[in-house]
Interface confidence: low
């Protein structure tokens, strides 16, 4: 790498007399005037705004006590204005200034782009006392420079409360490019158009940006960074990167994937979590999303039936969670179940059929025909039904429930009897005289209970009085 | 289910251009792409192009170019090839076969074939 | 474009026997891309294994494939007379899409 100085401003030694060491001296003014030479007046007019006082970056002292002669003006030399170099090289560069020597506690500071720099700097100040006056060289040396050393270098000097600032030293550090902006990987619709950013920055400028497809160069001629690169459309998955030059050399970007958007493999893995009468739960393991976030799934459902009409039911839910309750299914069915889902491409295809039960439900229909008879000189009632027309989904008949309310002045009592599948009259004891017994029946099966059948009443006197009430639900067809 | 029905069989003569037809059914269409595959009498498979039903967008084998002209027609879910300046070496079976494209192509599902007999 | 060698171009086989079929890439493929169909005689060519490995719908388990690279094989574990068919591998991996040349299966 080459290390350059370019002199930005003209050196203007300020002060007379040889200062130590190797820096330049000059007699010249600072305002380059031939025909001055020695101290310089206190009063000094801008070269720009002729006719206005110039102080800037200048402190003018005041009278001495003999107040027979002024003091000069104190300004830091100028120095070498623009230091270009490149990353993990040294560099070192100084600021001086002459000082009265009545001039005590003379601090010099350096200030980078606005701001002090404090701390763990490389900075060293020498004094260099004389008769009259103090040279002071202020060094700043950076080891290994950076892009961030990169910037604008003062140095900063209090007097009787003024402030004496120096020219700035420019510091340029030069490497390869440097990304600011990479591409990024996308996912895109076949055949639509898309962009891609790059973005590298020096020094040196400029950068100049190529664009890479799938390790072939995509423009000829290379663009001014920031570039974005329109690409019309892809109809297969492709890898862009750029590459970026500058007079150091080249650096190249990320690859990134650009993944054509696709529909989405079928999901995969449909398990039975539980099932009921009515219900089945369900899982899923989602398929490759084909490069397009899921939108929603659909459930299918046909019951494995030789007699059923082989219609599909669609339950459609949200992609997330990978979980649905299919409810509305018969009790005691098989069924058949694929999983499907969608992205903004279009439907997966369905997922592999499982196979699924419902387990027994609740007969549907209550016992037919019940009649209640009072039997007096047992002292009981003698209750019969008829077996209800239950659906085979209904399942096994395991019994029927009875419930028996009695009812007289003042009381109300309900009592439930359970008898077995093959009853088709049960007789209970009379609980309650004077009184009217309330008689309901429904059909159990291992899925539940059925509906009861409508109420059949009968009055139950007091002892000597007879009386039967027969009827409520009369067989199909009796009526 | 998934199904391509293709044309019936074609007798032409050289010179002349035909035009076979497939007609996709149990998908959504315009969703996947239509491909074409050639295969003369006792040989291999080999791949003519394919276009994309959404826009139709086309890609052809070189060899193919000029030759072979694919279209759709979405309304009725229908692809078409049409095969310009016919010689004997155009004598085959045509399939039509959609493509799960999803940057691990494949053919999934396939046409019946037309066989195309080029003769004077 | 990407040539698929297979071999053996034909092969007589019994019933019972373990049939292995290999598919040489000219080029690298990733095994995302590489496919098998069979055609039975006087019909289409059908799905068999795509993505190297994963049997399609349908397609008994005595079928497997594997590979990668350039190298890629199928197998059927036990040959069965219906297997009697064309053989055809395919990559899906770059334009021109391409298939190898075949494998008959006969039966001795």
């Known amino acids: 790498a080459i290390t350059e100085a370019r002199e930005e401003a003209k050196p203007y030694p300020l002060f007379p007399g040889p200062l130590p060491g190797s820096l330049q001296t000059d007699h010249t003014s600072l305002l380059s005037l031939p025909h001055t030479s020695g101290y310089q007046p206190a009063l000094m007019f801008s070269p720009t705004q002729p006719g206005r006082p110039y102080t800037g970056n200048v402190a003018i002292p005041r009278v001495t006590s003999a107040g027979s002669k002024l003091l000069p003006p104190l300004a830091f030399k100028h120095t070498v204005g623009h230091i270009i170099l490149s990353e993990h090289k040294d560099v070192k560069f100084n600021c001086s200034i002459s000082v009265p020597n009545i001039y005590q506690d003379t601090t010099i500071s350096w200030w980078k782009d606005g701001k002090e720099l404090l701390g763990a700097h490389h900075a060293i100040t020498q004094f260099y006392p004389d008769d009259e006056v103090t040279a002071i060289i202020a060094s700043f040396s950076i080891t290994s420079v950076q892009r961030s050393d990169n910037g604008s270098y003062i140095c900063k000097m209090k007097i009787n409360n003024e402030e004496i600032v120096s020219d700035p030293i420019y510091i340029e550090v030069q490497g390869l490019p440097h990304f600011t902006k990479q591409p990024e990987s996308m996912n895109v619709t076949r055949n639509t158009a898309f962009n891609l950013t790059c973005q590298a920055v020096g020094p040196p400028e400029p950068v100049n940006i190529f664009w890479v497809q799938n390790s072939s160069r995509v423009n000829e001629q290379p663009e001014k960074s920031p570039s974005v690169l329109t690409v019309p459309g892809l109809t297969e998955m492709a890898v862009f990167s750029c590459e970026a030059h500058n007079d150091k050399g080249l650096t190249v970007s990320k690859g990134v994937q650009i993944n054509i958007k696709a529909i989405p493999s079928p999901p995969t893995e449909v398990s039975i979590h539980n099932s009921t009468a009515h219900s089945i739960l369900i899982s899923w393991v989602p398929g490759f999303d084909g490069y397009s976030p899921f939108r929603n799934c659909s459930v299918q459902v046909k019951e494995v039936d030789p007699l059923s009409n082989g219609s599909v039911m669609i339950f459609n839910t949200s992609a997330s969670p990978h979980m649905y309750q299919i409810k509305q299914l018969q009790a005691l069915a098989n069924y058949s179940i694929g999983v499907s889902c969608m992205n903004e491409i279009g439907w997966s295809a369905v997922s592999p059929w499982i196979l699924a039960s419902t387990t027994e439900g609740a007969p549907s229909v209550a016992p037919l025909n019940v009649t209640v008879f009072l039997n007096e000189s047992r002292d009981n009632v003698d209750i019969r039904w008829m077996k209800p027309l239950t659906k085979r989904q209904a399942g096994e008949l395991v019994g029927y429930r009875i419930s028996h309310v009695w009812q007289s002045a003042g009381i109300s009592k309900e009592l439930l009897e359970e008898v077995g599948q093959n009853n088709s009259r049960a007789q209970i004891s009379v609980q309650v005289h004077n009184a009217t017994c309330t008689v309901r029946i429904a059909a159990v099966t291992k899925g539940g209970v059925g509906p009861f059948s409508d109420p059949v009443k009968i009055f139950i006197p007091a002892h000597g009085w007879v009386d039967h009430a027969p009827s409520s639900t009369p067989a199909p067809g009796n009526a | 289910q998934v199904q391509l029905q293709q044309s019936g069989p074609e007798l032409v003569k050289p010179g002349a251009s035909v035009k076979l037809s497939c007609k996709a059914s149990g998908y959504t269409f315009t969703s996947y792409d239509i491909n074409w595959v050639k295969q003369r009498p006792g040989q291999g498979l080999e791949w003519i192009g394919w276009i994309y039903p959404r826009d139709g967008y086309t890609k052809y084998k070189e060899k193919f170019k000029g030759k072979a002209t694919l279209t759709v027609d979405t309304s009725s879910s229908t692809a078409y090839m049409e095969l310009h300046s016919l010689t004997s070496e155009d004598s085959a079976v045509y399939f039509c076969?959609?493509?799960?494209?999803?940057?691990?192509?494949?053919?999934?599902?396939w046409g019946q074939g037309t066989t195309l007999t080029v003769s004077s | 474009e990407i040539v698929l060698t297979q071999s053996p171009t034909t092969m007589a086989t019994s019933p019972g026997e373990k049939i292995t079929i290999t598919c040489s890439a000219s080029?690298?493929?990733?095994?995302?891309?590489l496919h098998w169909y069979q055609q039975k005689p006087g019909f289409s060519p059908k799905l068999l294994i795509y993505r190297t490995s994963n049997l399609a719908s349908g397609v008994p388990d005595r079928f497997s494939g594997s590979g990668s690279g350039t190298s890629y094989s199928l197998t059927i574990g036990t040959m069965e007379a219906e297997d009697v068919a064309t053989y055809y591998c395919?990559?899906?991996?770059?334009?021109?899409?391409?298939f190898g040349a075949g494998t008959k299966l006969e039966l001795k």
């Open positions: 080029s690298s493929i990733s095994s995302n891309y």
């Open positions: 395919q990559q899906g991996r770059s334009i021109p899409l391409t």
């Open positions: 076969a959609r493509g799960f494209y999803s940057n691990l192509y494949y053919f999934d599902y």
